[in-house]
Amino acid sequence: QVHLVESGGGVVQPGRSLRLSCAASGFKFRSYGMHWVRQAPGKGLEWVAIIWYDGSKRYYADSVKGRFTISRDNSKNTLYLQMSSLRAEDTAVYYCARDLITGTTDYWGQGTLVTVSS
Amino acid sequence: DVVMTQSPLSLPVTLGQPASISCRSSRSLVYSDGNTHLIWFQQRPGQSPRRLIYRVSNRVSGVPDRFSGSGSGTDFTLKISRVEAEDVGVYYCLQGAHWPYTFGQGTKLEIKR
């Protein structure tokens, strides 16, 4: 049974930093590219970032480039999103996901809410 | 970035009737491996998204066959042959052929009373 559980969300002031985690279980984590996708309250989905199975490549949405860093620890089966210089427009539910593009099944976590507010 | 434009943004449908959602991309979604990476997601109220269709027309395992995808190049369509109550939600297209990946704005499917 595949499980993705995000944590680390909360209320943070503009300009501050926050680190999200996604604990993976039930599959061979170190073989998969992993994504972060976010959804602002009442809005649509926005793809945020991907990291390669071995951590060697990372791609980001233009809106977070230079501020957010995706990383992973394959020994801990955990995906991370380090968010810095946070802005009000980063307020969203952040989902980690596997297999967005290929494969016969996709998997998403339940999401963690990040609120950027003074 | 590749812009994904969905229409309509809101879609009221009678139960048992067909529904069709369009998705247009600002560039061709044919990837270097020859595959066209247009994906459709469903997000029911209060739930995480789930993928319905990948590579334009391939149904994800467990997705009912009333959902079908079609299209090529820059024009794509998601069809629901007979809408059921559980199909209520927002439908998103996603392109996975160019970095960064980009979603359409979403189409809200509602049941007509």
Partner: antibody
Amino acid sequence: DVLLQESGPGLVKPSQSLSLTCSVTGYSITSGHYWIWIRQFPGNKLEWMGYITYDGSNNYNPSLKKRISITRDTSENQFFLKLNPVTTEDTATYYCARDVADSYGNGYDAMDYWGQGTSVTVSS
Amino acid sequence: DIVLTQSPASLAVSLGQRATISCKASQSVDYDGDNYIHWYQQKPGQPPKLLIYAASNLESGIPARFTGSGSGTDFTLNIHPVEEEDAATYYCQQSDEDPWTFGGGTKLEIK
């Protein structure tokens, strides 16, 4: 194209150390992938020995863990196998290889690029 | 360790016919629907060459007459139609669980 080439001594004495080099051309070993050592014994049985990742971490076959070390020299684009001590049972053809990955971020722990292999005999 | 048992150990097939090689795993290598079984071809004096990865994905540049199938513990490599150049030894490999292990090989001869 990606090319891998093994080099090292053809003959090693029992209880000594075996050191092999894999020279990689056409791809930087720090750019990604797992860089793997595999050996094939007389009689053709294949054994996965271990790998080093693009960022220098390791994963070894538990049966060899006490004797094996895989390291690298990023400036020379080479990675190395050290087996210490060796016995006659380590006589084999040693291959270096690279793992398969797709364009979507996924890896498969299969090997698509291999060196030609180097034959090692352990004998006094 | 996961043991992979290949059968037959050798087979002789006529040109144009079908060759079928079986690989049985001592436990399931089906990790959430992803089958970590791979197939290689090895000719004398050469390193193994990847044919199929993840049970059924054809490696780039490999002819479509090579197909892989199976799930759980039972996997098959089919070659059809067999050509002269297919004479070689074929190995399956699992990477579902460390250590990665290989089957004992199947030697294919062309009649």
